[in-house]
Amino acid sequence: MRTEAQVPALQPPEPGLEGAMGHRTLVLPWVLLTLCVTAGTPEVWVQVRMEATELSSFTIRCGFLGSGSISLVTVSWGGPNGAGGTTLAVLHPERGIRQWAPARQARWETQSSISLILEGSGASSPCANTTFCCKFASFPEGSWEACGSLPPSSDPGLSAPPTPAPILRADLAGILGVSGVLLFGCVYLLHLLRRHKHRPAPRLQPSRTSPQAPRARAWAPSQASQAALHVPYATINTSCRPATLDTAHPHGGPSWWASLPTHAAHRPQGPAAWASTPIPARGSFVSVENGLYAQAGERPPHTGPGLTLFPDPRGPRAMEGPLGVR
């Protein structure tokens, strides 16, 4: 759920106006406090449905609940990509869709949700206990992934409710971006409150700003998502894996990550890996990916409308860097 709060406009301090300064000193902490409390993490939900008509046909729907711009969605099966999973599709808002059999009809449903139909026969077909994972790369939140599978007792035609599955991963872009700002804000807030204790109460003066204040947008986790935090993470079952998959190792990375210092960049790769920690059998987990967006102001590669990461239209090959990123 998105919460919107009206916040008084903050003016630059004017010398000699202790009262006004005091007023602003009081307002700023509350703004920061509101952000600290209400800024919930983004979420990814995954819904897996087996079609009643064809037992080998699945529909996977995934969505991203967050305020950022989606730049790339990766759908995999058999577990998260880079932790034994195999890429089924990648979707970019502008550059289009790429899908690997048995994926069919990957498409955008909205600007923040996608669907994918899987059709297969024999070795390449999915089965009821397959785990499907969706990873959303967005700016500024970073990369977030959740997995889901059909409940064991699912009848064909039924589907698991859309689980805002536990957020599995956040990369450094998100953590250093949003979280960093919030952390700084919270620390600053504590500093201000501490200072405020040792000062006389300031005289309140009317703010000289227009009545129409800017709106500060913050995200609060929904009830559904809070409940989801208690849902155990589905055990990845490898008995129904793509026949063509050898053991996957977390190496490589998408070629659209721009050049970064080696210690700070991990390029996820096409149908390749997104680094992750081992997956526990039960319980949710969060792992931090060693990946940063090339430039903080830029949105990632392909997915939501109007996004691009490389300044060079040739994309991946434009800039060769320390990690082979163009």
């Epitope: 970019h92 990375g253 790769q269 096409g270 991946p316 990123v325």
Partner: antibody, heavy 119, light 107 residues
Framework: QVQLQQSGAELARPGASVKLSCKAS????????ISWVKQRTGQGLEWIGE????????YYSERFKGKATLTADKSSSTAYMQLTSLTSEDSAVYFC????????????WGQGTSVTVSS | DIQMTQSPSSLSASLGQKVILTCRAS??????LNWLQQEPDGTIKRLIY???SLDSGVPKRFSGSRSGSDYSLTISSLESEDFVVYYC?????????FGGGTKLEIK
Amino acid sequence: QVQLQQSGAELARPGASVKLSCKASGYTFTNYGISWVKQRTGQGLEWIGEIYPGTINIYYSERFKGKATLTADKSSSTAYMQLTSLTSEDSAVYFCARDDGYYDAMDYWGQGTSVTVSS
Amino acid sequence: DIQMTQSPSSLSASLGQKVILTCRASQDIGSSLNWLQQEPDGTIKRLIYATSSLDSGVPKRFSGSRSGSDYSLTISSLESEDFVVYYCLQYTSSPWTFGGGTKLEIK
């Protein structure tokens, strides 16, 4: 600069196997995939499959499952394709091509390896 | 599988002439289409990627465009080295598929 160097021509007996190689240079091997493509004499191009050495994700065209096996050696930046149970239908030139798995598909190509199956 | 129907299969043209080669996709492939050039010695080179983007080092006389499910490669003024074989490639849905090729011959 990016280069894909393929192994030399092969002459094999029916029923035998051959293993073709594609050595990559000029880029980070694990950041891209290698696709393999078949071209019979005077005919068009046909995709066999691809391997992503960074994750060992492997994909095959249905037509080539059981015929081709793709592997990669990260230490030597080399991709391999083994063709088994060879018949005259497998006589062709086989190309490898680089692919990023996103939107830079088959941007660089090897020079091709000719395979002739004859008794 | 997505079928790519390329036409014409062969084309005779003169130096300096403008030619247009086309590929039709049996399903929606968005902009995920490349044009490749194959020399007589077998060497394959990508000319155009993502429907209309020119690869580096490729002469500006080559251009790509799309109209619905029809994709075109235009050579604005033929030069002697252009008389080779051209293929289109879709890479939106595996198996990736190629057009049957167009052999460009000098008239």
